[in-house]
């Protein structure tokens, strides 16, 4: 899996989107977890509704929300009131039994103030070998990194 960077601004909300094959993951609940250490487990932050048919309902855990468009195949995580401590490595997961498949590996990056980072778009403009994807959230940017650019620890 590549690691995708989502960049947000402290005090604002950040939306992270995780696309997936809706047929392959039909009937599966989803989850958002945070990598705890270099080789540590991925700790569950929030998961979709216990009833898969109600996955479209937004579920909150603290300042983090999750909602799943099961037909369109997009899992959306909202981090409200983003702060420096939210920065780090996360995963979108598809759950089946006690197992979890990784849908996307994510690096959340938190900036101090949008006016202080007017050049962020220039800094993050991708090269030809990279895909760029707008996160469609004010002051947020996402960018896929090439495999190997960021070593992501294995999940347990």
């Amino acid at each position: 899996h590549n690691t995708t960077v989502f960049q947000g601004v402290a005090g604002q909300s950040l939306q992270v989107s995780c696309p997936y094959d809706s047929m392959k993951h039909w009937g599966r609940r989803k989850a958002w977890c945070r990598q705890l250490g270099e080789k540590g487990p991925c700790q569950r932050v929030v998961s979709t509704h216990n009833l898969w048919l109600l996955s479209f309902l937004r579920r909150w855990n603290g300042s983090t929300a999750i909602t799943d468009d099961t037909l369109g195949g997009t899992l959306t995580i909202t981090l409200r009131n983003l702060q420096p401590h939210d920065a780090g490595l996360y995963q979108c997961q598809s759950l089946h039994g006690s197992e979890a498949d990784t849908l996307r590996k994510v690096l959340v990056e938190v900036l101090a103030d949008p006016l202080d980072h007017r050049d962020a778009g220039d800094l993050w403009f991708p090269g030809e070998s990279e895909s760029f994807e707008d996160a469609h959230v004010e002051h947020s940017i996402s960018r896929s990194l090439l495999e190997g650019e960021i070593p992501f620890p294995p999940t347990s």
Partner: antibody
Framework: QVQLVQSGAEVKKPGASVKVSCKAS????????MHWVRQAPGQGLEWMGW????????NYAQKFQGRVTMTRDTSISTAYMELSRLRSDDTAVYYC?????????????WGQGTLVTVSS | EIVLTQSPATLSLSPGERATLSCRAS??????LAWYQQKPGQAPRLLIY???NRATGIPARFSGSGSGTDFTLTISSLEPEDFAVYYC?????????FGGGTKVEIK
């Protein structure tokens, strides 16, 4: 093992600029943030900002905005911190410190420090 | 800006004694607090993160506790190499800030 080796001491005049380097080894340079923290003589620690070596993206403490520039050269696994318009109260030891990606705002490894003296 | 106040400024103890260092935040930082040790002429070293998690290679005699605004670093039995200055750091909000430090000196 992780090592951060910084450039040597500098003496600068007020109004000048200084550029401190920090060479990383023992880990994937683009796989962690690099922070810069300074410590005035006999004083506490003051965070200046960070750079993501993978993207070059930066985030500076408001106090240093407009005076500090953090850059990197991934080909030689080296981060740089340049501070301009130096004043006497910029005299300090400047440290680079690694922020691991899983917890980017803690500083798990530090350079040995670079003393920058600003004096006329 | 979150202000971290450390107390006492200096702690005079003997090897083998228990050291209790305090760090108080001007507003809640939840559990987003780290502790560092700094010896003269050296760079700081990470001891504790997330208020209570020991960093890699840190001896079990170091422990951290607290949440919200009040935090404690405890050294259960001081070793000769533990006499140093200790700083707390919050990573809850920008700018990241440090406390003024507590010096643990030999009595």
């Amino acid at each position: 093992q992780v090592q951060l080796v910084q450039s040597g001491a500098e003496v600068k005049k007020p109004g000048a600029s200084v550029k401190v380097s920090c060479k990383a080894s023992g880990y994937t340079f683009t796989g962690s943030y690099m922070h810069w923290v300074r410590q005035a003589p006999g004083q506490g620690l003051e965070w200046m900002g960070w750079i993501n070596p993978n993207s070059g993206g930066t985030n500076y403490a408001q106090k240093f905005q407009g005076r500090v520039t953090m850059t990197r050269d991934t080909s030689i696994s080296t981060a740089y911190m340049e501070l301009s318009r130096l004043r006497s109260d910029d005299t300090a030891v400047y440290y680079c410190a690694r922020g691991p990606l899983y917890h980017p705002m803690i500083f798990d490894y530090w350079g040995q420090g670079t003393l920058v003296t600003v004096s006329s | 800006e979150i202000v971290l106040t450390q107390s006492p400024a200096t702690l005079s103890l003997s090897p083998g004694e228990r050291a209790t260092l305090s760090c108080r935040a001007s507003q809640s930082v939840s559990s987003y607090l780290a502790w560092y040790q700094q010896k003269p002429g050296q760079a700081p070293r990470l001891l504790i993160y997330d208020a209570s998690n020991r960093a890699t290679g840190i001896p079990a005699r170091f422990s951290g506790s607290g949440s919200g605004t009040d935090f404690t670093l405890t050294i259960s039995s001081l070793e000769p190499e533990d006499f140093a200055v200790y700083y707390c750091q919050q990573l809850s909000t920008y700018p990241l800030t440090f406390g003024g430090g507590t010096k643990v000196e030999i009595k």
